[in-house]
């Protein structure tokens, strides 16, 4: 008799999820000698232990603590790049500027990037059919809780000048409900972080507006200022040229505004 299985609104666990996590862990630790001590089998066991046999709407940050402990990593706290709704450009930037780190350039972020996972209450099975959707089902699902946990820790680790890349093409350039707006902004430590510098990335070729004057950016500035952190903002009018100038800063065309 086939067992009744909960149908969730979101996509199921990414196929070959265990193999993908393990392979990514091995690859990451090969590339980063400072993480060579990490036992990837133990990392997978801790990852699995966070959600297997648990109701996928009842996951807590506590469930991920063994994984957090194993994945503890020291990144230069003054080289952190946060992003919101513009992941690809942020990653293209750190591909070139390798002394800077997005969350996905850390071991735990790298392991989980673009993956989905969940289990089922009281069975050791991974659910490859469906997983809870944050809006339609529940917010305390394995994926959302994971990203909330690692994002909080990443923001807490930041110091000096923290950069954030924001998508100037969105109706809400700064969105209070994004991970950046709801988690990272509130976990920057005022005693360590001097300035949050926003880079607003323009979408249109002919868009010469000063998006740093956008009401949502002013809202971000207000939140940050109330937390005793300075705020600055830059328009990146041409992201293609911006990346090119990161690659070749000596280029004569890179002295003008980008």
């Amino acid at each position: 008799v086939p067992r009744w299985r909960q149908q969730w609104s979101g996509p199921g666990t990414t196929k070959r999820f265990p193999e993908t996590v393990l392979a990514r862990c091995v690859k990451y630790t090969e590339i980063h000698p400072e993480m060579r001590h990490v036992d990837c089998q133990s990392v997978w066991d801790a990852f699995k232990g966070a959600f297997i046999s648990k109701h996928p709407c009842n996951i807590t940050e506590e469930d991920y603590q063994p994984l957090m402990k194993l994945g503890t990593q020291t990144v230069p706290c003054n080289k952190i790049l946060l992003w919101s709704r513009i992941k690809d450009l942020a990653h293209q930037f750190t591909q070139v500027q390798r002394d800077m780190f997005t969350l996905e350039d850390t071991l735990l972020g790298y392991l989980a990037d673009d993956l989905t996972w969940c289990g089922e209450f009281n069975t050791s099975k991974i659910n490859y059919q469906s997983c809870p959707d944050w809006r339609k089902d529940c917010s305390n699902n394995p994926v959302s809780v994971f990203w909330k946990t690692v994002s909080r820790r990443f923001a807490e680790a930041a110091c000096d000048v923290v950069h954030v890349m924001l998508n100037g093409s969105r109706s809400k350039i700064f969105d209070k409900n994004s991970t950046f707006g709801s988690v990272e902004v509130h976990n920057l430590q005022p005693e360590k972080v001097q300035t949050l510098e926003a880079w607003v990335i323009h979408g249109g070729r002919e868009d010469s507006r000063d998006l740093c004057q956008d009401p949502t950016i002013k809202e971000l500035e207000s939140i940050i200022s109330k937390r005793n952190i300075q705020f600055s903002c830059k328009n990146i009018y041409r992201p293609d040229k911006f990346l090119q100038c990161v690659k070749n800063p000596e280029d004569s065309s890179c002295t003008s505004e980008i």
């Epitope: 090969e30 590339i31 980063h32 000698p33 750190t94 591909q95 790298y110």
Partner: nanobody
């Protein structure tokens, strides 16, 4: 573009040590895998040792394994080749070369034809 400048060569006795440096100018030294090559008089240029952008992978030719150590300091834009127990057959012009490497691609093959930038070389002479 990346410019590479080797230094540290010289005349030594067999059994001695030398440390070669490869100083890079230009941006993003840490985007490149670095290889050391050498060319002995009348011979083809050959691969000696290589290091990935993050120092995660090291490669050595069989002839230098256990005697030479490659390293790099990305903050100083410099790669090094520590050469111990030198032999007369290590006499050659030593070149460093750079090859772009993806951030999350750990494998690399430092073939001579795949190298994008070369230094002018530093001469190492080992007398018996």
């Amino acid at each position: 573009d990346v410019q590479l400048q080797e230094s540290g060569g010289g005349l030594v006795q067999a059994g001695d040590s030398l440390r070669l440096s490869c100083a890079a100018s230009g941006p993003h030294f840490n985007n490149y895998a670095i290889g050391w090559f050498r060319q002995a008089p009348g011979k083809e240029r050959e691969f000696v040792a290589g290091i990935s952008w993050s120092s995660g992978s090291l490669l050595y030719s069989d002839s230098v394994k256990g005697r030479f150590t490659i390293s790099r300091d990305n903050d100083k834009n410099t790669a090094y080749l520590q050469m111990n127990s030198l032999k007369p057959e290590d006499t050659a012009l030593y070149y460093c070369a750079a090859q772009y490497q993806e951030r999350y691609y750990s494998d690399f093959s430092l073939k001579e034809k795949g190298m994008e930038y070369w230094g002018k070389g530093t001469l190492v002479t080992v007398s018996s």
